[in-house]
Interface confidence: low
């Protein structure tokens, strides 16, 4: 048999240890039981609708679900801290009947030297200190316990881990006389997991490590380490998975090169290169081994680290991500877009689509936006007729069925959903865009014209007249 000890012994799942997967005591709810789907396979949507309707009708009976708030717990191990030395922590809403745990990593850029960290501390202290954190938070989007808002995992145990380490969840250095700030992102995740084991995580079946923006990149950097940690701690039966939202960045050439003076204008490769040294950043070991010493920054980029990961990861990424455009020095100010910039933006979408080619579980709408999974309306966007919660459900099923050695996608249940149309907001289900100055909502046609996309240029490749295209876009088709 294969080992399962520390980082050395991470093998097949043996019979569970006495305390890990104990059978529920009498009267304890059991969340999941095997179902034979063969009879309903042909009409899965109708079946799921009935299940959802049943769940929603039973929902009011569950008193524990009435309080939507996640409650703050500062870490008991106070040596694991935010940038300023205050204890890190997490917000938790337990769902006692469930063996699913969702751990969400918050995003919020980063800082990579004393100057821009000082500036961040002055202007965004919540992202560097726990001193002013509220006692509770409301779960939204994938963190919501309402089946209407979160048809995917509404019944899970929800954990929101605030971002207060400014290191893309990668740091492993404490505050000292030499270090003005602590950068302990990677250690915060490990400590949260350790403390949650005492709060019911030890009985989990699935742990989904999710995150948005810097938190999405944090998922890619930490998901395998969490799996190894749980096996090391004696819980190899917990299936660890990742959901990386808006954290799949490209180390592409900037539209206009600028010197590395602050977080926003510094090219991502240079910012991360400097950051790793400043944070004492750690990256997944299998990825690190592929690059020379000093080149670990490569592992912060999704398309380079993803192939080295062992845990299943679902990647969610807008093809025209606003944070990506920002670091590429593209600022859409409301002025008409010159052709050079239009081509740059279209090429960005093409490059991003290419990097997702071999990512079997991905959802990439052709929209100009940033972050999605904890937005209340995260269910609205569709790619090829499939919403993100539906795609995640299909992903769960594909992982559940993978022991059948079938690599073919589940019929009518796609998990690789990447838009192929070539310009921002060519997908009519994209989130509404507002004029930066008037705050007015714009439809797709208005937005494209506002961006300086010539309708003739856009319509031609589609084999359409500009008037036909405008009509289609205005009707949301």
């Amino acid at each position: 048999s294969e080992g399962r000890k520390t980082w050395r012994r991470r093998g097949q799942q043996p019979p569970p240890p006495p305390r890990t997967e104990a059978a529920p005591a009498a009267g304890q709810p059991v969340e999941s039981f095997p179902l034979d789907f063969t009879a309903v396979e042909g009409n899965m949507d109708s079946f799921m609708a009935q299940v959802k309707s049943l769940a929603q009708s039973l929902y009011p009976c569950s008193a524990q679900q009435l309080n939507e708030d996640l409650r703050l717990h500062l870490l008991l191990n106070t040596s694991v801290t935010c940038n300023d030395g205050s204890p890190a922590g997490y917000y938790l809403k337990e769902s006692r009947g469930s063996r699913r745990w969702l751990l969400f990593l918050e995003g919020g850029w980063y800082c990579f030297n004393r100057e821009n960290c000082d500036s961040r501390y002055d202007t965004m202290r919540r992202l560097m200190s726990s001193r002013d954190w509220p006692r509770t938070r409301t779960g939204t989007g994938i963190l919501s316990s309402q089946p209407e808002e979160n048809p995917y995992w509404w019944n899970a145990n929800m954990v929101f881990i605030p971002y207060c380490s400014s290191d893309v969840w990668s740091g492993a250095s404490s505050k000292s006389e030499k270090n003005e700030y602590a950068f302990m992102g990677a250690l915060i995740i490990q400590e949260v997991v350790r403390e949650l084991l005492g709060r019911g995580l030890s009985g989990a079946k699935v742990l989904l490590l999710a995150g948005s923006s810097a938190g999405g990149t944090g998922v890619l950097l930490n998901v395998d380490r969490v799996a190894e940690q749980l096996e090391k701690l004696g819980y190899p039966a917990i299936q660890v998975r990742g959901l990386a939202d808006s954290g799949w960045f490209l180390d592409n050439k900037q539209y206009r090169h600028t010197d590395c003076v602050d977080t926003i204008t510094c090219a991502p490769t240079e910012a991360i290169r400097r950051g790793i040294r400043y944070w004492n950043g750690v990256v997944p070991e299998r990825c690190r081994r592929q690059f020379q010493e000093g080149e670990e920054w490569n592992c912060f980029f999704g398309y380079k680290v993803y192939p080295t990961l062992r845990c299943p990861v679902f990647v969610v990424q807008w093809l025209f991500d606003e944070a990506q455009l920002t670091v590429d020095n593209v600022h859409l100010t409301g002025q008409p877009v010159q052709e050079g910039l239009r081509l740059y933006i279209q090429n960005l979408g093409r490059e991003l689509r290419h990097t997702l080619k071999d990512v079997p579980a991905s959802f990439a709408p052709a929209c100009l936006s940033h972050e999605i999974i904890i937005r209340s309306h995260w269910t609205d966007v569709q790619v090829k007729g499939t919403s993100l919660p539906r795609a995640l459900h299909c992903w769960d099923r594909s992982l559940h069925d993978s022991h059948k050695a079938s690599k073919t996608p589940l019929k009518g249940c796609p998990v690789h959903l990447v838009d192929s149309c070539p310009w921002p907001h060519c997908n009519p289900s994209c989130p509404t865009v507002r004029d930066q100055f008037t705050g007015q909502e714009m439809n797709v046609a208005q937005f494209l014209m506002h961006m300086g996309f010539d309708m003739q240029t856009v319509a031609q490749p589609q084999g359409l007249e500009p008037s036909e295209l405008l009509g289609m876009l205005s009707n949301g088709s």
Epitope: G3, R8, R9, G11, R19, L233, G234
Partner: antibody, heavy 117, light 112 residues
């Protein structure tokens, strides 16, 4: 600094049992596995098994499953190995070691077990 | 069980020479997590083993850089670039990828 302290020697009669100890200090005991290794005089090393104090989980070498029982007392940060039905074949030096990030990084000095009537 | 075979059994060297010890496993010891948990230990007479190299090629803290490890799959090598008197003793390879974990039979490094 990390230390694993083992008694120097144990003298036991054939057929009896012995419980040897390995006291850990200088680190959080519950976060690292403890391995046990046997070395007969002039011979090589044999892995007996290991114990994870954080969850009570053990892995044994099938060969030692009926011979060795691994336990810990977390309150005193001490790991124990009990060997039963002792014969002269069990006379050896027994080491405990801590498993770090995937490697046996610190070892005790070893306990010399002599089985003799 | 994975059988670890070390060669040579005994290696006579002069101080300052390079020494090379080979270790072959009876099956691939790449772990399912992608790591290869192959370690090298040195045991001096009357002492407990000391870790030199872990995961094939990583030097443990405090180990001089004259020690290096290499290899993959089933074939592994420990090299000492310039042997010093304090390096004499028995070297063991060890695999920690598959239970039960197993040691090689040992190679005795001695003065010519």
């Amino acid at each position: 600094q990390v230390q694993l302290q083992q008694p120097g020697a144990e003298l036991v009669k054939p057929g009896a049992s012995v419980k040897m100890s390995c006291k850990a200090s200088g680190y959080t005991f519950t976060r690292y596995w403890i391995s046990w290794v046997k070395q007969r005089p002039g011979q090589g090393l044999e892995w007996i098994g290991d114990f994870y104090p954080g969850s009570g989980r053990t892995d044994y070498n099938e060969k030692f499953k009926t011979k060795a029982t691994l336990t810990v007392d977390t309150s005193s940060s001490t790991a124990y190995m009990q060997l039963s039905s002792l014969t002269s074949e069990d006379s050896a030096v027994y080491y405990c070691s801590r498993d770090g990030h995937g490697e046996g990084d610190y070892w005790g000095q070893g306990t010399t077990l002599t089985v003799s009537s | 069980d994975v059988l670890m075979t070390q060669t040579p059994l005994s290696l006579p060297v002069s101080l300052g020479d390079q020494a090379s010890i080979s270790c072959r496993s009876s099956q691939n010891i790449v772990h399912s997590n992608g790591n290869t948990y192959l370690e090298w230990y040195l045991q001096k007479p009357g002492q407990s083993p000391k870790l030199l190299i872990y995961k094939v090629s990583n030097r443990f803290s405090g180990v001089p850089d004259r020690f290096s490890g290499s290899g993959s799959g089933t074939d592994f090598t420990l090299k000492i670039s310039r042997v010093e008197a304090e390096d004499l003793g028995v070297y063991y390879c060890f695999q920690g990828s598959h239970v039960p974990y197993t040691f090689g039979g040992g190679t005795k490094l001695e003065i010519k």
